[in-house]
Amino acid sequence: GCINITSSASQEGTRLNLICTVWHKKEEAEGFVVFLCKDRSGDCSPETSLKQLRLKRDPGIDGVGEISSQLMFTISQVTPLHSGTYQCCARSQKSGIRLQGHFFSILFTETGNYTVTGLKQRQHLEFSHNEGTLS
């Protein structure tokens, strides 16, 4: 089956959600780990990640269609210390499959705002930190 990983971001007030979404078949969930790394060009692994999610097979989902599993990493207030390059990755201990998402970046600017760039589908988010709105 076709397995892929995408990265996205959303804002709720001052909170920034970084989301790693893995699309896979139901039976492929077992043994899969999704993880998010920061500033790790070569050694992104569950052990060096900021957060990881171990997928479990959900017997409640019928059929063999494609399903998605999400890892959400929430930053309550983005600060200059969050500036850097992030990457969503996944791997299967069962099949040996390794997935690496596109690199995306958080840049905290001198004005106190931040931008998230490099997301799939040319998604470019610019946030005003103080106002907590999408600008």
Partner: antibody, heavy 119, light 107 residues
Framework: EVQLVESGGGLVQPGRSLKLSCAAS????????MAWVRQAPTKGLEWVAS????????YYRDSVKGRFTISRDNAKNTQYLQMDSLRSEDTATYYC????????????WGQGVMVTVSS | EIVLTQSPTSMTASPGERVTITCRAS?????MHWYQQKPGASPKPWIY???KLASGVPDRFSGSGSGTSYSLTINNMEAEDAATYYC??????????FGAGTKLEIK
């Protein structure tokens, strides 16, 4: 278990230098931004400086800018605070602390090291 | 720079009493964190993001507030709660600021 152990404190004359170290264990040090927070005798807490996980970005409170330098060695799981041109008002217990990645709280603190600046 | 003003600066409470410590910010802030510090010890995170209790903190503690006014409340004061409590916030560009502390003693 997370452990932060500071060292390098002591008595120093005004205008002189001192370098503090903080040895970290029990977590993936290279993933976390780190900070120094100080507390003058019988006084409150005061943030001094922070450094990002990779060590490339540093931030300071205005009163120590140009005199203090925060740095880290991820291979040694250690962060440092180089303190130059010390003043009597720098006398304090200096705490090493970790930045919580998802929040702006300092979640782990060392036991602190005393720095006394006096002639 | 945002200034955090804690009140009272010190207080004494009886066991079982309800205690409220307030922290006022000179400008609106998004979240407030609270730390507990006992004599000779390091500060411990106690309440974070205004109302979330840190690991191991008894549920007699609670936090609330928004904008410029925040508070930490102890529902039934116990002897082990005697300590100094500090509020803390983050904003740009002054970064991290703390209140001057509230010393809480037991009768």
């Amino acid at each position: 278990e997370v452990q932060l152990v500071e060292s390098g404190g002591g008595l120093v004359q005004p205008g002189r230098s001192l370098k503090l170290s903080c040895a970290a264990s029990g977590f993936t040090f290279s993933n976390y931004a780190m900070a120094w927070v100080r507390q003058a005798p019988t006084k409150g807490l005061e943030w001094v400086a922070s450094i990002n996980s990779g060590g490339g970005n540093t931030y300071y409170r205005d009163s120590v800018k140009g005199r203090f330098t925060i740095s880290r060695d991820n291979a040694k799981n250690t962060q440092y605070l180089q303190m130059d041109s010390l003043r009597s008002e720098d006398t304090a217990t200096y705490y090493c602390a970790t930045h919580n990645y998802e929040s702006t709280v300092f979640d782990y603190w060392g036991q602190g090291v005393m720095v006394t600046v006096s002639s | 720079e945002i200034v955090l003003t804690q009140s009272p600066t010190s207080m004494t409470a009886s066991p079982g009493e309800r205690v409220t410590i307030t922290c006022r910010a000179s400008s609106s802030v998004s979240y407030m964190h609270w730390y507990q510090q006992k004599p000779g010890a390091s500060p411990k995170p106690w309440i974070y993001e205004t109302s979330k209790l840190a690991s191991g903190v008894p549920d007699r503690f609670s936090g609330s507030g928004s904008g410029t006014s925040y508070s930490l409340t102890i529902n039934n004061m116990e002897a082990e709660d005697a300590a100094t409590y500090y509020c803390q916030q983050w904003n740009y560009p002054s970064m991290y600021t703390f209140g001057a502390g509230t010393k809480l003693e037991i009768k």
